[in-house]
């Protein structure tokens, strides 16, 4: 009989982000005697699942185990064999799940369930699915960034984003677009925070951090999208909904069934004289931009001051990193050059915009049609929500930077996640060899 | 020298209970998935059911064919693991022998000496 | 569930000859496959693990080979204590299964 096998010096972890348009499973890997030192965790492999999201799921819950196996036997091929057994796996799902729970606790509890059982069933050291909260999921975003950066390291930072930046501890701020919420986190100078829900208090690395945060649940990009239809079709004279947010010459039929499934247009909600219409598309930036801002309200504010929708959010301060959906929609529309000012993001947006549909489907042919017809959308409401929603200006507008990766590990929530759950963020400045600590995020 | 002795067998009629235990020693048995393996008179080997770590919340797999019906446990502190068995059946008949792997994972390095069940009226 | 089919069930052959015993899988398991061998009475006891990987204390005669849905057990030279029932086993997901076996008796 053999021994079992002596573990590798390094050690995996594998994190799936069950968001609302799909699931991703990162792997990361660390030198198992460097645990508690800042910036040693790395991605090794990102892994796209096929197929949507796992709140669509919930009439057919029997084709989860067999959504999640491409991905997990990815993970499988990745990790040593020997690494399995201790790979912890955690699985955290955002905004679509907690839609879901919001129309149904039962239905949400059964598709997590069904996840569970089918993660527990693969050799690895499963640690459970949860719905996390919004605030879990900007605070570990903001984590996740600042940690690759070097941010909560007292050496000198390895890797620069900026390149006129050099040895800046100042932490990054967090903007974070998914389909379903976006995301909002960063240390405000020297300002109190109004309301203790958007509160968070850090000690990491030795160091205290009074971090403001806030998720809007619904601002997502593809749920603005179905806010903004919703609140459109109200005023339509008839099945024609002529929409400034897509390409002039585009046509899509829309079920109003479908527009009304999701709990984000239940304040639009109207009994319409048909089950169908249609969206033709007349691609016009500043009507797309007037209409997007009407889901923001900013008539009322118990604060000093706010974002939209009554919800405080202090005088923004230092460097942000907008990823996820920022990075992706901006990304395609080339527009996340450090230099591109926000004058110039308009411009183009405009141009865009205005391209005809047919045109835009040629100069993209491969890239699929649904994803395509809604980039002029949504980077209007990526430029709305930055400069109406979260009160960026011109000149703020350079503190932004879109990112994808830093240094080869993707920016969103799931590492800063897994650094949390595997205690590897500790509260003190660790010795140069590591103390066992206890107080954690 | 790893050993496991399992105990607890006999005869059993259908609709009755049983349990089954297997002590283990010579290894570090918290640190490893424990399972049950049975082979019915004349017949191939069947998996029964999995117990992982104490780590892993004791997570347990079963067979479609016990499922429900079998409940597989640990006591680390005792280094044991036990099989209770309820509303047997006939077919449940079989030479239940307890398995794990001190190499890697779902293979079977280490076997007991098997524990005859017999379920008949 | 992946089924596991051995042949042939029987294999007649004397001692020095070689044996050549298949296992093939229902769908792809890549090379989590495993080879047991028990003898009437007892226990069975691990030969092969992950298709071709040897143990330590087994004659350097048992070998493995195959990967995805194809895999073979090769005795080079019969022993007479090899005379045996064979079991291949898939070890890549739940539920864990075995082949119906392969009984190799002396010709």
């Known amino acids: 009989t053999q021994n079992k096998a002596l573990p590798e010096n390094v050690k995996y972890g594998i994190v799936l982000d069950a968001g609302s348009s799909h699931t991703s499973l990162y792997i990361y890997k660390w030198p198992a005697e460097k645990e508690n030192d800042t910036g040693v965790v790395h991605q090794v492999e990102e892994c796209r699942v096929k197929g949507p999201g796992i709140s669509k799921f919930v009439q057919k819950v029997n084709e989860i185990g067999i959504y999640l196996t491409d991905c997990m036997e990815r993970a499988r091929e990745v990790i040593p064999r020997s690494q399995h057994q201790e790979t912890p796996v955690y699985l955290g799902a955002t905004a679509g799940m907690r839609l879901l729970r919001m129309e149904s606790e039962e239905l949400a509890d059964r598709v997590l369930d069904v996840v569970e059982r089918s993660l527990s069933n693969y050799p690895f050291d499963f640690q459970g699915a949860r719905i996390i909260t919004g605030q879990e999921e900007g605070a570990y975003g903001w984590i996740t960034i600042n940690y690759l950066l070097g941010k909560f390291s007292q050496k000198t930072r390895w890797f620069s984003i900026v390149p006129y930046e050099t040895n800046n501890q100042e932490t990054f701020g967090a903007l974070d677009l998914g389909g379903a919420s976006t995301q909002v986190t960063f240390v405000p100078q020297n300002q109190t925070i109004e309301s203790p829900d958007n509160a968070l208090q850090f000690r990491l690395y030795g160091k205290d951090y009074n971090v403001y945060t806030h998720s809007f649940l619904c601002y997502g990009k593809d749920q603005a999208l179905w806010q903004k239809l919703a609140k459109d079709i109200q005023v339509a004279s008839n099945e024609i909904l002529r929409d400034p947010c897509f390409h002039p010459g585009y046509k899509k039929v829309v079920n109003v069934s479908d527009l009304y499934k999701t709990p984000c247009t239940k304040r639009f909600e109207m009994t319409l004289p048909f089950q169908q219409f249609e969206i033709q598309g007349i691609g016009n930036y500043q009507q797309c931009h007037q209409s997007i801002l009407e889901l923001f309200n900013t008539s009322y504010c118990p604060y000093s001051q706010c974002a939209f929708n009554g919800i405080f959010l202090p005088p923004l301060q230092g460097d942000f990193g907008a990823f996820s959906a920022f990075y992706f929609v901006m990304k395609f529309l080339n527009l996340t050059s450090e230099k591109v000012s926000q004058e110039k993001v308009t411009e183009m947006m405009k141009k865009f915009c205005a391209q005809p549909w047919e045109e835009i489907k040629t100069s993209y042919a491969g890239v699929k049609e649904k994803y395509l017809s809604e980039y002029c959308f949504s980077g209007t409401y990526i430029l709305s929500l930055l400069l109406q929603g979260y009160h960026f200006t011109a000149d703020s507008w350079e503190h932004i930077h879109f990112i994808g990766k830093i240094q080869g590990s993707d920016a969103g929530w799931t590492l800063g996640y897994m650094l949390n759950l595997t205690n590897m963020i500790p509260a003190e400045q660790p010795l140069s060899t590591p103390l066992s600590h206890s107080t954690y995020v | 020298e790893v050993q496991l002795v399992e105990s607890g067998g006999g005869l059993v009629k259908p609709g009755g209970s049983m349990r089954l235990s297997c002590a283990a020693s010579?290894?570090?048995?918290?640190?490893?998935?424990m399972n049950w393996v049975r082979q019915s008179p004349g017949k191939g080997l069947e998996w029964v059911a999995e117990?992982?770590?104490?780590?892993?919340?004791?997570?347990?797999h079963y067979a479609e064919s016990v499922k429900g019906r079998f409940t597989i446990s640990r006591d680390d502190s005792k280094n044991t693991v036990y099989l209770q068995m309820n509303s047997l059946k006939t077919e449940d008949t079989a030479v239940y022998y307890c398995?794990?792997?001190?190499?890697?994972?779902?293979?079977?390095?280490?076997w007991g000496q098997g524990t005859t069940v017999t379920v008949s009226s | 569930e992946i089924v596991l089919t051995q042949s042939p069930a029987t294999l007649s052959l004397s001692p020095g000859e070689r044996a050549t015993l298949s296992c093939r899988a229902s769908?792809?398991?890549?090379?989590?496959l495993h080879w047991y061998q028990q003898k009437p009475g007892q226990a069975p006891r691990l030969l092969i693990y992950?298709?071709?990987q040897s143990i330590s204390g087994i004659p350097a005669r048992f070998s493995g080979s195959g990967s995805g849905t194809d895999f073979t057990l090769t005795i080079s030279s019969l022993e007479p204590e090899d005379f045996a029932v064979y079991y291949c086993?898939?070890?890549?997901?739940?539920?864990?299964?075995f082949g119906g076996g392969t009984k190799l008796e002396i010709k």
């Open positions: 398995t794990t792997q001190l190499d890697l994972y779902w293979f079977f390095d280490v």
């Open positions: 010579g290894f570090t048995f918290s640190k490893y998935w």
């Open positions: 117990i992982r770590l104490k780590s892993n919340k004791y997570g347990t």
């Open positions: 769908q792809s398991i890549s090379d989590y």
């Open positions: 992950y298709a071709s």
């Open positions: 086993q898939n070890g890549h997901s739940l539920p864990l299964t």
